[in-house]
Interface confidence: low
């Protein structure tokens, strides 16, 4: 924004009524009236170019400084060419001197040269030569000087003539202000320009109605330069929640729109599943049955809990069950669906039921599942299991109802024993096995069946209550097919897979070397 000039003194506008003091009185400077461009103008003129040394002073009236710190002095003047005078006028000069003096009171007609300080020697860019002079063509020069900082209540200017032919047509003294300004939704008051060229006056702005300094943001400030120009804007105001920027003001969001926080963004239309908002809304309320999670942005549509998992299967595999399901048909409008699996076991004999989380093992933690399958192991045989899969999303916690599907499965067999070869010799094989501890109490005996590989006509059976057996009287360097099966009161359990174990050849005997 361009600087505003506040005029303290304007000789040309005063119509010759300022009554400046001349020294010596009645000599030197004289107030004259002339016509220029068909308009009467006043000027102070001196032209003592033939009279030797000159020391003529013209002093302005006392000028009240007011709030000015640095004043600017604009002079419009004309100077005749010394060569236009007969004989060149040896004592003629083509410059004059500008002075100032500060004071706290008006000295009136008491003029003292010693109180004045020289500002500069004023020289014309163009002098008025004879032809111009005769043609009434005034070569007007404009010179500007500045003085500051000023500290007293007022000041005088003075013009010293040292023998020139000069006419002062305009003396304008002013100071500069940075004008009242609206920028970045901040109002900056009219401010006096500083006095020192390198310095900038820092001015605090005031946020316009319904605008605020954003959290962590800088307060609006601008810098008022010496020339009255606003420079270096710092910080800004933003329209507060519920308001948006319209030109240089903050306007309330229209009905059906909202703005969540102080920002540069405009008001946004209320999202899906919200009620129409009133004017100046900071958010839009959810429709009945729809919710907003605490972490959901106000711009996100309102959502609801999901429906139950769409399809659930439980496939038993010995003492394991694989649960599989498909995502809910209605996600509730969210993508943060997770699943929780819970387990209940029932004893067929008594019909008693209870939770079974402690006794079973899941392939991954059963709460907060993102995948749609899980394997449950360590299930007890001859037990009925019911599995519940619940679907939840970010707003499920805001309602009491749950969305779940259940599947039941009966475990009729023990889990197949895990078999390993503990040792071997040329004529024997030492075999051990294990089943999950919850199932061991139901096992009566273990049945070990073995035969030579390739011989399908005969096989041998050994029964034991323990978890290992040594099979003797075997042929050397021969591969045997070995299977272990648990026997329960209710019948046979699941058999292990058939393992191939080979006895040692006579050359590499070494009893029971694995």
């Amino acid at each position: 924004a361009q600087g505003k000039e506040v005029v303290l003194l304007d000789f040309a506008a005063a119509g010759g009524e300022l009554g400046w003091l001349t020294h010596p009185y009645g000599k030197g400077w004289d107030l004259m009236q002339n016509i220029m461009n068909d308009m009467p103008i006043y000027m102070y003129s001196v032209c003592n170019v033939m009279s030797g040394d000159q020391d003529n002073w013209l002093r302005t009236n006392w000028v009240y400084r007011g709030e000015a710190e640095r004043i600017f002095i604009e002079l419009k003047f004309t100077v005749r060419d010394c060569n236009s005078f007969p004989g060149g006028a040896s004592s003629c000069k083509e410059t004059f001197n500008l002075y100032y003096a500060e004071s706290d009171l008006d000295y009136g007609t008491n003029f003292q040269k010693r109180l004045f300080t020289k500002i500069d020697t004023i020289a014309p860019d163009e002098i008025t030569v004879s032809s111009d002079f005769e043609a009434r063509h005034v070569k007007l020069n404009v010179e500007e000087r500045s003085v500051g900082p000023l500290t007293r209540k007022g000041f005088y200017l003075a013009f010293q003539d040292i023998g020139a032919c000069v006419a002062l047509l305009s003396v304008r003294v002013y100071y500069k202000k940075c004008p009242e300004l609206l920028q970045g939704l901040a109002h900056f008051p009219e401010t006096i320009a500083g006095s020192d060229a390198p310095s900038l006056a820092t001015v605090a702005g005031t946020c316009v109605d319904h605008a605020v300094v954003p959290p962590g943001g800088e307060e609006p400030r601008m810098h008022c330069a010496v020339d009255g120009e606003w420079l270096v804007p710092i910080g800004q105001c933003l329209c507060q929640a519920g308001y948006e920027k319209v030109e240089d003001a903050c306007q309330a969001c229209s009905p059906g729109f909202f703005k969540f926080e102080a920002s540069e963004s405009p008001c946004l239309e209320c999202p899906e599943h919200t009620l129409p908002s009133p004017e100046g809304a900071t958010s839009c309320e959810c429709e009945e049955g729809f919710f907003r999670a605490p972490q959901d942005p106000a711009s996100m549509p309102c959502t609801r809990p999901p429906s139950a998992p769409h399809y659930l299967t439980a496939v038993g595999m010995g003492a394991k069950v694989e649960l599989r399901w498909t995502p809910p048909q209605d996600s509730g409008g969210r993508e943060d669906i997770v699943y929780s699996v819970t387990c209940e076991q029932c004893w067929p004999e008594s019909g008693e039921c209870g939770p079974c989380e402690a006794s079973v093992r899941y392939s991954e933690p059963p709460h907060g599942l993102t995948r749609t399958s899980v394997t449950v192991s360590d299930l007890e045989p001859h037990m009925n299991y019911t599995f519940t899969v619940e679907a939840r999303n970010g707003v499920s916690g805001l309602v009491t109802s749950r969305s779940f599907r259940t599947a039941s499965v009966s475990i009729n067999q023990t889990e197949p024993p895990k078999v390993r070869l503990e040792g071997r010799s040329t004529t024997s094989l030492s075999v051990s096995w294990s089943i999950p501890p919850p199932q061991q109490s139901r096992v009566w005996k273990y049945e070990v069946t073995y035969r030579k590989k390739g011989d399908s006509n005969s096989y041998n059976v050994r029964r034991t209550e323990g978890f290992s057996v040594t099979l003797d009287d075997l042929a050397p360097d021969t591969t045997y097919l070995v299977q272990v099966q648990a026997l329960t009161q209710e019948g046979q359990g699941a058999g292990s897979k058939v393992h191939e174990f080979q006895t040692l050849s006579p050359e590499g005997s070494g009893n029971l070397a694995v």
């Epitope: 506040v6 007011g66 009219e190 401010t191 006096i192 006056a201 001015v203």
Partner: antibody
Framework: EVQLLESGGGLVQPGGSLRLSCAAS????????MAWVRQAPGKGLEWVSR????????HYADSVKGRFTISRDNSKNTLYLQMNSLRAEDTAVYYC?????????????????????WGQGTLVTVSS | DIQMTQSPSTLSASVGDRVTITCRAS??????LAWYQQKPGKAPKLLIY???NLHTGVPSRFSGSGSGTEFTLTISSLQPDDFATYYC?????????FGQGTKVEIK
């Protein structure tokens, strides 16, 4: 000499409209912030509205916001106040007032303004 | 809005008396306070601006002081021309609120 002369007051029915004018002379009008201040009969002074030297920014008291509009024509040295949807409580003498920062001898102009020059006032009566 | 409260509401005094009027702001307004004088049927006249600065042409018996929330207008020696109502006004905020007025009447 600074002179401010208000006109346009009178009797008006509730819900009606009125336009006040303030003719300025004796100073450079375009340098002045101008304002309207009112005084209900037997009551104190209440600031109504202000307008910057070149026509902006404008501010309004909450009691008149949305009903009154302040404007100025610097070429005619005139200030205006358009008053719509008038109410009984708008009954008052309306003064035009002015402020020139050139006469405010402080390092930085105040956040708002005070009023150096006042007109003689014009009476607005809102009654049925 | 900033509330301005003047006290007293009415003040009876004699010519030559020293008179003090107080103005309190509901929040700090620095020194952005003006004082006006109003006579019946007349427009207000500016006396003091920026809490203590005397406006051009105002007699020196008027003076102002204070800053923040507490301000005073003092008439050092009451003159017959001074019987009037006096108002304070804050210009620290856009609302530019006035006090309710203090009437100085002849005792």
């Amino acid at each position: 000499e600074v002179q401010l002369l208000e006109s346009g007051g009178g009797l008006v029915q509730p819900g009606g409209s009125l336009r006040l004018s303030c003719a300025a002379s004796g100073f450079t009008f375009s340098h002045y912030m101008m304002a309207w201040v009112r005084q209900a009969p037997g009551k104190g002074l209440e600031w109504v509205s202000r307008i910057g030297p070149s026509g902006g920014p404008t501010h309004y008291a909450d009691s008149v916001k949305g009903r009154f509009t302040i404007s100025r024509d610097n070429s005619k040295n005139t200030l205006y106040l358009q008053m719509n949807s008038l109410r009984a409580e708008d009954t008052a003498v309306y003064y035009c007032a002015g402020y020139d920062s050139g006469y405010d001898y402080v390092a930085v102009a105040g956040p708002a303004e005070y009023f150096q020059h006042w007109g003689q006032g014009t009476l607005v009566t809102v009654s049925s | 809005d900033i509330q301005m409260t003047q006290s007293p509401s009415t003040l009876s005094a004699s010519v030559g008396d020293r008179v003090t009027i107080t103005c309190r702001a509901s929040q700090s307004i620095s020194t952005w306070l003006a004082w006006y004088q109003q006579k019946p049927g007349k427009a207000p006249k500016l006396l003091i601006y920026k809490a203590s600065n005397l406006h051009t042409g105002v007699p020196s018996r008027f003076s102002g002081s204070g800053s923040g929330t507490e301000f005073t207008l003092t008439i050092s020696s009451l003159q017959p021309d001074d019987f009037a109502t006096y108002y304070c006004q804050q210009y620290n905020s856009y609302s530019r609120t006035f006090g309710q007025g203090t009437k100085v009447e002849i005792k």
